[in-house]
């Protein structure tokens, strides 16, 4: 009987491992789809730019390396911020490194005072994990500093030089990001 129980336990363990693997594959697939979309968008923009020798970023957007950033002048709740960015062929800001964070916070200091700006970071309701819009997790140094006490969905925002969290239904400015166009040669 003990042997039977231990066999069942091992089978369940194996099933669990397979499910975890499947979930990991799905997360990777989701992320790769999001990245492919970004690359497609960049490719389309670059193709268009070769027709008109335009600047790497649209008017009122800031360039840093291969990215263009738009610092909004309107308030929005998090979901509408994302929609606003999508309408401009961009997404809410995804901060990949400390260097990018420093550039953003430095730019904000020059543009405006110490306001709140939504970025593309939200907390998964079930696991409580922080995720960027493409399904990837932020690097440990780029996790929101404080956990919001809100029972509602929680999203990430930048203020001064910190990444913080708040109820997604609050009104804030926001930052969009898209690929800079490669200048046609």
């Amino acid at each position: 009987k003990l042997l039977q129980v231990s066999t069942i336990a091992m089978q369940q363990q194996e099933k669990l491992i397979q499910q975890e693997r499947a979930l990991l594959n799905f997360t990777e697939w989701k992320r790769s789809c999001a990245l492919q979309m970004k690359y497609c968008q960049a490719f389309m923009q670059n193709s268009l730019s070769s027709a008109h020798n335009s600047s790497p970023c649209p008017n009122n957007w800031i360039q840093n390396r291969e990215s263009c950033y738009y610092v909004s002048e309107i308030w929005s709740i998090w979901h509408t911020s994302q929609e606003n960015c999508l309408k401009e062929g961009s997404t809410l800001l995804q901060i990949e490194s400390k260097e990018e964070m420093d550039f953003i916070t430095g730019s904000l200091r020059k543009i405006k005072g110490s306001y709140d700006y939504w970025v593309g970071l939200s907390q998964d309701g079930h696991s409580g994990r922080w995720l960027w819009q493409d399904g990837s997790s932020p690097s440990p140094g780029l996790l929101p500093a404080e956990r919001s006490q809100s029972a509602n969905q929680v999203c990430g925002y930048v203020k001064s030089n910190s990444l913080l969290s708040s109820n997604c239904s609050t009104w804030k400015y926001f930052i969009c990001e898209k690929y800079a166009l490669r200048s046609s040669v």
Partner: nanobody, 116 residues
Framework: QVQLVESGGGLVQAGDSLRLSCTAS????????MAWWRQAPGKEREYVAV????????HYSDFVKGRFTISRDNAKNTVSLQMDSLKPEDTASYYC?????????WGQGTQVTVSS
């Protein structure tokens, strides 16, 4: 082309109230978050208040909080700004527009003058 029309402005005494109204020709406002801005002579245009498309959430600039109320009537295709306890510093031209990165062409605005 969409045309925004603001109305309801006027000359009032400090402490009085006014109700501004905004409507759009050729466009249904119900799908859009809408906002009011104002511009005083020689100053930049500043954000006053915003309301979601459904009307269930609003937000205000600190300088009007508790005095101004933004609302909408989607059936009548209008967005309103109720202005109470007006101050001389509220003197400006008031404009409404869609709350989006790309805004519609600005209307003529409606002039509000508050005398002390």
């Amino acid at each position: 082309q969409v045309q925004l029309v603001e109305s309801g402005g006027g000359l009032v005494q400090a402490g009085d109230s006014l109700r501004l109204s905004c409507t759009a020709s050729e466009r249904n406002l119900r799908s859009y978050d809408m906002a009011w801005w104002r511009q005083a002579p020689g100053k930049e245009r500043e954000y006053v208040a915003v309301i979601t498309s459904s009307g269930d959430s609003t937000h205000y600039s600190d300088f009007v909080k508790g005095r101004f109320t933004i609302s909408r009537d989607n059936a009548k295709n209008t967005v309103s700004l109720q202005m109470d306890s007006l101050k001389p510093e509220d003197t400006a031209s008031y404009y409404c527009n869609v709350n989006a990165i790309r805004q519609w062409p600005w209307g003529q605005g409606t002039q509000v003058t508050v005398s002390s």
